[in-house]
Structure formats: C-alpha cells, structure tokens
Interface confidence: low
C-alpha cells in the first residue's frame, strides 16, 4: 500500500481467482483512543472499532472511503483505491490503446518546437467518475523539473456505438535548453482513477522525436508571365523555434489534382519558395519538417491553383 | 577552419558537410519509431557518448559570445563517433551491406573533424569506451543505438554550422 495523496491510498493487488489479497491496517488520525468506530463509504453499519482497523483487501468491494467516527462526529477518512496486476502486468482498462506508432501506446505527445513545451493526449470511452493527474520530469534517477497543467477534456467523438473522449495536457520543461542535444528523455506519468480503480501510464521520449511543426503560413501563388508555372511562397510557422538560421526547416511542395488517383508532383526544398506547374483544378500544398532531424512532417497548408 | 587559437571555421563548408552527415545518418538507420531502443537494456553502452549540453555554448547566443567552446565539443563528438564507426561494432559480424551508407558516414565524420582541426593542432579528445559485444545480435542493437545517438548529435552540429554560416561568416 502507498499514499497517492493526502488520505488516498493505493493497494496493489495480484488479480486472479482466489488471490489472497492484501492485509491493510488503517489508523484513525486522532488523539482519541477510545470509542472509535469505522464505516465504509455511506454504510450505516460499523465495520469495526478501535483506533486501528485491519482489513483484507481482495476486490473492489473492499475499496472505498473508510471513515472513523466518535460520538457521531467524523474524525478522519482514508480512501482506498485498487491497482490490479494480472499475470504480472498492471491493468490498462481506463485508457484506449492508440496503436500508433506501435501497440500499447496509450499516451501520445507532440511538440511544435524545441522550447521544452509539449502536449500529450490520450483516449478513453469512460465518461464519468474519472480523474487524471499528470507529472513529468527530464530523466528519472536525478529528475529535472517539467511543469504540467491540468488534464482537460479536449474532444468527443462518436466511434460506432461508442463515444470516445480525448483528454490532453500541456507541459513545459522548467529549464529548457532548446539548442542542446538531449541525453536524458522526458518522462511523462499519468495517474488515472476511475471510481475505485487506479492505473498509471508512462511515456518516455526526447523532444526531438516528437517534433511536429505547424504548417507553413502565408502560402501564396504568383503566376509567372507567359508560363503555366507559378511561384509558390510561404513562411515559417509562428510557433517554430527561432532564429530560423539555427532552427531550420525543410519543405515538401505537392501539386495534387482534384482526383486522389491523379499523379502527385512533389518537390523538396530548403527555401521558402518554389516554382511548380499549376494544373487546372489542382491544389498546391506545402508541409514542413525539421531540416536536420527526421521527426514528423507538419500537416499540409494548401491553396487552390485557380 | 576552427583552430584552438580561436580563428573562425570555414562555416559554409562545415554547413554543407554537416548537412550531408544528417542525410547519411538517417539513411544508415531510417527506422524511426519501429524500435524503441531505450526499452532495450544495456544502457551503459551508449550513455558514454559525448553530448552537446546546455553549457557548451552551441546555442545562438553562445556561438556569438565565443564559438570555440562549442566547436571543441563538436570536434570531440565527431572524433568519438568516427572511432566508433571504425570499430569492430561496425566492422564485425553481421557484415554491413556493400552499399551501406555507414562507410560514407565514417568518411564524412573524419572530413568534418579535419575541417575543424587541421593537422598539428590538438584539442583534447574523449576516450572511447571499450565496447565489444560478443553476440552478433548485440552488435546489431548497439549499431542502431549508436546511429540513433549520432543522428541527434549531427542535427545539433548542423544547426550550429548553418547558423554560423548565416550569421558569423565574415
């Protein structure tokens, strides 16, 4: 058993039929010695008496809020949550496996630049009695600070018969060093509590591996005289790290016909302009990627040819 | 050329070669995301590699203040990786394919380190740890780890030289 926060405790249980469970001793937080009784949740029945209460925790019915009283007055509470371990593996019932970039990916994180700010998100089909708490650090043995905000519900989607809820959190490394080569990964830890079930999820990454720039901005076309060619120009996204002479991007320019089946023409360039042939009804799209480290491409920025 | 005496490097040449190094490092090990190398044990094998750290002056302000700190750190790293790529980790079994970019990568690391430190000048270099994995599969895993680490190192070096070429060239 360990304390998650004040008066909230997590009991770790091997989860299999007829498992012995855990013996837990609860102590009433009071100077009183006599006349103390215990209840669980809203029970009117007294579970036991005395300053300490020893219980066998085997299943969710044994978890919940234990309260000690004296003379009709509440003295203290202890909330017990369960963390299940099945076949040596901690349960992952609360969050959905996003399967990208690989199986057992529950948390996904992205950064728009090298400032040490990043966003993580996760999915669940649970809509009520659900709380999340997020902690993060750089490295684990001698952790350096990363500050995370509160997790918030950021999207709701209907998937078949089910509703899916997306939660996200923003974190910022306290002493970020954008130009350094990371040697210790960022660790993100999410505590999830659904009713009386506790689970924790972790992700470990370097900022450089989760970089995904915003799309290029101010995408413009300038027709070239007496030619089917156009000059496409764009700018670095506002959210990208500066100076751009140091944090450089590379770009992919694509000419795409109306039909998805039509051949796409692609040009790669380090410049913020390119000359392409603009076909009728086609559109021109540009996306960006870190010039020196192959992390994710941005989403496309597009303009029609006409 | 960046010599220990403090004159400036050939920023543009360094920029071109470091950008080529980035391309080669990624073509040598393009499998991003398919294998989380940090999950594999064996941490001590790659945590001795020299990293470009916050205090090394490789950020824009640090380069403007005194680029020598940073260039020395980059030089140390280039020599370190050049030795690793020439060691039995890469020369031993399983043999690299004849058209593997590792050979080019090795040569380019040497080329850039020589641009930074001509003959006759010596910055102190870091000792390379004695890594001789016994099993071919261990060697393969170690190659991946070294290449992943090299990708990160050369990315920072390329940024330094690109910025130097754009802002510090005479």
């Amino acid at each position: 058993i360990w304390e998650l926060k004040k008066d909230v405790y997590v009991v770790e249980l091997d989860w299999y039929p007829d498992a012995p469970g855990e013996m837990v001793v609860l102590t009433c937080d009071t100077p009183e010695e006599d006349g103390i009784t215990w209840t669980l949740d809203q029970s009117s029945e007294v579970l036991g008496s005395g300053k300490t209460l020893t219980i066998q925790v085997k299943e969710f019915g044994d978890a919940g809020q234990y309260t000690c009283h004296k003379g009709g007055e509440v003295l203290s509470h202890s909330l017990l949550l369960l963390h299940k371990k099945e076949d040596g593996i901690w349960s992952t019932d609360i969050l959905k496996d996003q399967k990208e970039p690989k199986n057992k990916t529950f948390l996904r994180c992205e950064a728009k630049n090298y400032s040490g700010r990043f966003t993580c998100w996760w999915l669940t089909t649970i809509s009520t009695d659900l709380t999340f708490s997020v902690k993060s650090s750089r490295g684990s043995s001698d952790p350096q600070g990363v500050t995370c905000g509160a997790a918030t519900l950021s999207a709701e989607r209907v998937r078949g018969d089910n509703k899916e809820y997306e939660y996200s959190v923003e974190c910022q490394e306290d002493s970020a060093c954008p130009a350094a080569e990371e040697s210790l990964p960022i660790e993100v830890m999410v505590d999830a509590v659904h009713k009386l079930k506790y689970e924790n999820y972790t992700s470990s990454f370097f900022i450089r591996d989760i970089i995904k720039p915003d799309p290029p901005k101010n995408l413009q076309l300038k027709p070239l005289k007496n030619s089917r060619q156009v000059e496409v120009s764009w700018e670095y996204p506002d959210t990208w790290s500066t100076p751009h002479s140091y944090f450089s991007l590379t770009f992919c320019v694509q000419v795409q016909g109306k039909s998805k089946r039509e051949k796409k023409d692609r040009v790669f360039t380090d410049k913020t302009s390119a000359t392409v042939i603009c076909r009728k009804n086609a559109s021109i799209s540009v996306r960006a990627q870190d010039r020196y480290y192959s992390s994710s491409w941005s989403e496309w920025a597009s303009v029609p040819c006409s | 050329r960046a010599v220990p005496g403090g004159s400036s490097p050939a920023w543009t040449q360094c920029q071109q070669l470091s950008q080529k190094l980035c391309t080669l490092a990624w073509s040598a090990h393009p499998l991003v995301g398919h294998m989380d190398l940090r999950e594999e044990g064996d941490e001590e094998t790659t945590n001795d590699v020299p990293h470009i750290q916050c205090g090394d002056g490789c950020d824009p302000q640090g380069l403007r203040d005194n680029s020598q700190f940073c260039l020395q750190r980059i030089h140390q790293g280039l020599i370190f990786y050049e030795k690793l790529l020439g060691s039995d980790i890469f020369t031993g079994e399983p043999s690299l394919l004849p058209d593997s970019p590792v050979g080019q990568l090795h040569a380019s690391l040497l080329g850039l380190s020589q641009l930074l430190q001509p003959e006759g000048h010596h910055w102190e270099t870091q000792q390379i740890p004695s890594l001789s994995p016994s099993q071919p599969w261990q060697r393969l895993l170690l190659r991946f780890k070294i290449l992943r680490s090299l990708q990160a190192f050369v990315a920072v070096a390329a940024r330094v030289f690109a910025h130097g070429a754009a802002t510090l060239s005479p």
């Epitope: 060093c177 954008p178 | 400036s8 950020d59 824009p60 302000q61 640090g62 005194n66 680029s67 005479p170």
Partner: antibody
Framework: QSVEESGGRLVTPGTPLTLTCTVS????????MSWVRQAPGKGLEWIGV?????SAYYASWAKGRFTISGASTTVDLKITSPTTEDTATYFC??????????WGPGTLVTVSS | DVVMTQTPSSTSAAVGGTVTIKCQAS??????LSWYQQKPGQRPKPLIV???TLASGVPSRFKGNRSGTEYTLTISGVQREDAAAYYC?????????FGGGTKVVVV
C-alpha cells in the same frame, strides 16, 4: 587579456561622440563585446552588443541613439546626439554571459551646455 | 526586450548571515543570466554566469539558481567585503537588460 575604454570627455548636447574600446590578448572574432553605461549614483544600463559576425543589437531605448561598430582590435560606440541624460560612465565588456567575462575600467562622458 | 525585475532594491545582513536576491525574467531566457557585484568606483565583477556557474575566483558562498523564469543569487555566510551593489543581466539571445540592482549592507 584586457579591454579598455577611451574617448570619454565633456561634450555639449547634440555633439556626436565616439568612444573606443581597445582589446588586447584576444581576437574580436571569437567574442561578443557589449557596451554598458552607468549614470552617477544609478544602476547599470545595457546599451548593445556586437556579435562575432559583426552584427550589432541594441536595447530598444538605445536604437537610433547609439551605433556600435567593430574593427580588428577595437569596438566603437557612437553617441549620435548626446543629451544631458547620457552623462554616465561607459563600460565595454567581453562575453557578458561567459566564464571568461572581462570588463574595462570605464570612461566618463559628461554632457553639459 | 526582456524585462528583468530584481528584488529587493536593498537589504542588510549580519556577518555570517544569508542574503537572497531574486530576478524575474519577463520571458523564458534559458540559462542566459549573469550576476554581477559592483563596489563604488569600481567596474562590475562577474559572480555567476549562465544562471548557476560560479565565475572564476569567486568564493563558493555565492550560489546561483534558476527555477523557470525566476533566478536567485544566494550569499551564504556573508562577509564584510560582500557589501556592494548586485545586478542581474538577462538576455533573449540578442538583446539583454540589467535588473534594477540590489544594495547589500553588511551590519
């Protein structure tokens, strides 16, 4: 290795004045050089810096009022049109964020009619 | 420009006591922050560079610390010779600014 400012004197308002920072024992193309001033009895005030590539950057209040330029062993600070508020000791400093930071002794500029 | 807000503007300490001076940057400035000591009629002397690195020849009683955009200079075991004005200097990569200064009196 040292830096020394010179050129400080009494000038009348509106008369341009150039201060010179002379360095010895190190190369200017390896260091940034900053100009800082301090009015009598007041705090330090950062004016601007010249970087390794010769680009100069200024505090927003100093733009247009000062010009920093560099040569092989000197860095100049030109006060374009001095006012009485520019009366101060002017310091030249090498690499203000680095361990091998060096400051000159300062040169006094008095602007008075 | 980055604005450096330095507190307090003056403070006093007994010999052997501790002095803490803070500088708050108006935006993220990474570890680009220096602390200077200046005695009357003298040039500024660097104490701490890059937020927490002790400048050469500076006694170990001077310590620099950073938390987010708040920077702290702590003098532990204050000596008589520590009576001086102290300034922080912070920058965003191109443009810098000094804090308003803190006068330290040793009693």
């Amino acid at each position: 290795q040292s830096v020394e400012e010179s050129g400080g004197r009494l000038v009348t308002p509106g008369t341009p004045l150039t201060l010179t920072c002379t360095v010895s024992g190190f190369s200017l193309n390896s260091y940034s050089m900053s100009w800082v001033r301090q009015a009598p009895g007041k705090g330090l005030e950062w004016i601007g810096v010249i970087g390794l590539g010769g680009s100069a950057y200024y505090a927003s209040w100093a733009k247009g009022r000062f010009t920093i330029s560099g040569a092989s062993t000197t860095v100049d600070l030109k006060i374009t049109s001095p006012t009485t508020e520019d009366t101060a000791t002017y310091f030249c400093a090498r690499a203000t964020y680095s361990d091998d930071n060096i400051w000159g002794p300062g040169t006094l500029v008095t602007v008075s009619s | 420009d980055v604005v450096m807000t330095q507190t307090p503007s003056s403070t006093s300490a007994a010999v052997g006591g501790t002095v803490t001076i803070k500088c708050q940057a108006s935006q993220s400035i990474s570890s680009w922050l220096s602390w200077y000591q200046q005695k009357p009629g003298q040039r500024p002397k660097p104490l701490i560079v890059r937020a927490s690195t002790l400048a050469s020849g500076v006694p170990s009683r001077f310590k620099g610390n950073r938390s987010g955009t708040e920077y702290t200079l702590t003098i532990s075991g204050v000596q008589r010779e520590d009576a001086a004005a102290y300034y922080c200097l912070g920058g965003d990569g191109n443009v810098s600014n000094f804090g308003g200064g803190t006068k330290v009196v040793v009693v």
